[in-house]
Amino acid sequence: EWVMPPIFVPENGKGPFPQRLNQLKSNKDRGTKIFYSITGPGADSPPEGVFTIEKESGWLLLHMPLDREKIVKYELYGHAVSENGASVEEPMNISIIVTDQNDNKPKFTQDTFRGSVLEGVMPGTSVMQVTATDEDDAVNTYNGVVAYSIHSQEPKEPHDLMFTIHKSTGTISVISSGLDREKVPEYRLTVQATDMDGEGSTTTAEAVVQILDANDNAPEFEPQKYEAWVPENEVGHEVQRLTVTDLDVPNSPAWRATYHIVGGDDGDHFTITTHPETNQGVLTTKKGLDFEAQDQHTLYVEVTNEAPFAVKLPTATATVVVHVKDVNEAPVFVPPSKVIEAQEGISIGELVCIYTAQDPDKEDQKISYTISRDPANWLAVDPDSGQITAAGILDREDEQFVKNNVYEVMVLATDSGNPPTTGTGTLLLTLTDINDHGPIPEPRQIIICNQSPVPQVLNITDKDLSPNSSPFQAQLTHDSDIYWMAEVSEKGDTVALSLKKFLKQDTYDLHLSLSDHGNREQLTMIRATVCDCHGQVFNDCPRPWKGG
C-alpha cells in the first residue's frame, strides 16, 4: 500500500551518511519501471538536500545529523512516476520526526537574580524566583525538565541553609529563623538548574538576597547621664546635645530618633528636638530659668524612632542634670507698669507716688532710681527711695504731652552689681481735672443785618472736663446788653447773639461773659459787623444799590 508511517530519527546522529531511513515502494511497478522522487522543505526546498531518495530503489536517505532544536518535524511528499513521466500514485505524505537528545544544558535567564526580604520574617516566606530554560524536549522526555537547587550560600550565618528553593518553580523561600540585617545584610546564593529533572546537566547563577531593615533595634543613649550649666533667664539657650546609637539603617525612619522629656520639667522650661544631620537630641530652654527659684533641674529624656518598633523593645532613657548659673538680674518694678492718679496743677515738690523695684538676686544690692523719659519735665525722682514728686506744673490739657488724660513716664532702677543692671518701669499718670479753663466762644466775629436780623449762634468750648465744663451761662457786660441780647441754648453748649435795637451799619465790640458749670468766668470780646440788610447776611455787607 502507498502509505508510510512517521519515521522517528534521533537528532545528532553519527551516520555514516547518507543513512538509509525507509524505502518507498509502489505496487504498480509490475509491468513498468517506476521512478521515485521527494519534494518539500528539506528535500527540494530550504533546507535543501537534507533528504534525498534513490530514484530507482526508492530508499529515503538522510545526508546529515539533524537538530531537533532547529527543526522538530519534516513534512515531505513522495512521488512515483512511470518511465514516460506519468504519475502512478498520488503524492504520499512522509513525516520525519526528530527525536530529542539531551544536547542542551539549562540556561538561567539572568546571570544574577536580585530579591529582598524583611529581616526576622517567618520561615516559609517567599523571597524571589529564579528562572532557567532548556531547549530540549520537556514534554516527551525529561531532557528539558529543569530542577532547581541551592548549591551554596554565603555567608553561612546564622545557618548554612537559610533558604530553600522549589524544585520546579524556582521560587526561593526562607527556611530558617534568624535573618538579621544588622548581622548579615545580604546573602549570595549559588543556584543550580539541572535538566533531566535533576539528574542531568547543571548550570549555575547567582541569587542575591538583600535583607531589608525592620525597626528591630531601639536607639540607645551614649552616654546615659549628662550634666549641663545654663545661665538663668536665657530663652532658646542650647543646654545639651544627647547622642544616641541605633543599629538600624542610617537616615531611615527606623534610625531617626524622636526625643521626649518624660520627667523633671514640670514648669515646661525645656524643649528637645532632633538634629537633622547628627540625629542628636538638642535640649534647649523654652522659658528662662530662675536661679533664685530653682538652681537645678533633673530631666529624664526618652528616645524612640520616627518609625514604630517592629518588635517589643525597651525604651532608652537619659538623665540630664541642668545646673542654673546665677546672673546679675535687673531690678524689677512692681508692677512693671503702674497706673496712678494725680491732680493737674499740684504744687512743685508735692508727692505724686512712690514707685520702687525689687532685685531678683539673692544678695542685697542697692537700687538707685532715675527718670529716663519725662517729655514735659514735670517730675523728679528721689534716687534712693523712688519717691516721685512734681517738678513742674502738671497740665491735663497739654495735648502735646498728655494723651487721653494720661502722661507716660519711664523710670529706671539700677542695681549695684558688677556690672550693674537696669530695670525699667512705666508710670502712667492719669491726670485728674481742675477747673483751670474758662468757656470760649467760637467764632469771635459775627456779621448781622440791622433789619429783621437772624440771631448768630456761637459754639462754646471748655478744655476742662465735666463738671468744670457745660452747661454754660452767658452775660453781656460793659453796656453791650443795651443793643444786644445773649441767649444760651437749652443744651447749654451754644449762645445766640441777636440785636435788640436798630444799629447803623458799622463794626461793634461786644463784651460776652461766659461761665462754666463750676462757675469759672471768662470774658471774651466779640467783633460784630452790622449791615444794612434784611434777614441773613454772609461774609460782607451788601453794596448799596444805585439806580440808573
Epitope: 517567618m122 530553600t164 527556611i175 530558617s176 529563623s177 534568624g178 517592629a310
Partner: antibody
Framework: EVQLLESGGGLVQPGGSLRLSCAAS????????MSWVRQAPGKGLEWVSA????????YYADSVKGRFTISRDNSKNTLYLQMNSLRAEDTAVYYC??????????WGQGKMVTVSS | QSALTQPASVSGSPGQSITISCTGT?????????VSWYQQHPGKAPKLILS???KRPSGVSNRFSGSKSGNTASLSISGLQAEDEADYYC???????????FGGGTKLTVL
C-alpha cells in the same frame, strides 16, 4: 536542655474562652518562630497558628481565624494562644512547637482542651 | 483528609524491617527536601526522628532512615523493637501557608 512547657488547658463550655501558655527554656526564644499544633482525640496532627520570632507576623488556619489569637512575650520567653468562641470541634490536645528548617522541633508536652456543655 | 497520604497501619515482627510511605505532591514532598518524621507514643507528644528527609537528630537510633523519590518519601525502621510500636507522622515543607503539611499517621504494630 531545650524545653517547652504548656499550661492553661481544661474544660470549657461552647462559646467560652481559654488561654494557653507555653514557657520556653534552653534556647534563644526570640530568634525562633513558634507554632501551635493540635490533635483531636484519635485523630492526626493539625496546624493551628504560627508567629514570627519578633511577634510582628501572625498566621492562622482557616478553622480558627478570627477566634484564636497567637502572641508572644519575648521578655518572658512565653508563647500564648488566646482561644475565644470555642466550639466542640476545638476539643484536642494543643501542642506548642518551634518552627524552622522545614520542621517542628521541639514540641511541648501538650495540654488537653475540652469544649463541652 | 490529610495533605500527605500514609498507610493507616503497618506491622512487623521484632528484628524485621518495615517501610512507611508518605505521598504528597510536586508542591510539597516533590518540591523540597524538607520531609520530617515524628514518632508519637500513646499519651505523649510527637518526637522528631528524621528531618530533611534523612537527617537524624542526636539521640535517635540509626535504625531509623529516610529517603525520597519524586513525590513520595519513606521511613524505614530496621531491627524492629517493641518500643518502636507507636504512631508515625510525616510532614513536609510546602509552598505558602501553612508551610507545613502533615500525613494522616501510620500505626506501627510490633507483633
Amino acid at each position: 536542655e531545650v524545653q517547652l512547657l504548656e499550661s492553661g488547658g481544661g474544660l470549657v463550655q461552647p462559646g467560652g474562652s481559654l488561654r494557653l501558655s507555653c514557657a520556653a527554656s534552653g534556647f534563644t526564644f526570640s530568634s525562633y518562630a513558634m507554632s501551635w499544633v493540635r490533635q483531636a482525640p484519635g485523630k492526626g496532627l493539625e496546624w493551628v497558628s504560627a508567629i514570627s520570632g519578633s511577634g510582628g507576623s501572625t498566621y492562622y488556619a482557616d478553622s480558627v481565624k478570627g477566634r484564636f489569637t497567637i502572641s508572644r512575650d519575648n521578655s518572658k520567653n512565653t508563647l500564648y494562644l488566646q482561644m475565644n468562641s470555642l466550639r466542640a470541634e476545638d476539643t484536642a490536645v494543643y501542642y506548642c512547637a518551634s518552627w524552622g528548617d522545614g520542621t517542628l522541633n521541639p514540641w511541648g508536652q501538650g495540654k488537653m482542651v475540652t469544649v463541652s456543655s | 483528609q490529610s495533605a500527605l497520604t500514609q498507610p493507616a497501619s503497618v506491622s512487623g515482627s521484632p528484628g524485621q524491617s518495615i517501610t512507611i510511605s508518605c505521598t504528597g505532591t510536586s508542591n510539597d514532598v516533590g518540591a523540597y527536601n524538607y520531609v520530617s518524621w515524628y514518632q508519637q507514643h500513646p499519651g505523649k507528644a510527637p518526637k522528631l526522628i528524621l528531618s530533611e528527609v534523612n537527617k537524624r537528630p542526636s539521640g535517635v537510633s540509626n535504625r531509623f532512615s529516610g529517603s525520597k523519590s519524586g513525590n513520595t518519601a519513606s521511613l524505614s525502621i530496621s531491627g524492629l523493637q517493641a518500643e518502636d510500636e507507636a504512631d508515625y507522622y510525616c510532614s513536609s515543607f510546602t509552598s505558602g501557608l501553612p508551610w507545613v503539611v502533615f500525613g494522616g499517621g501510620t500505626k506501627l504494630t510490633v507483633l
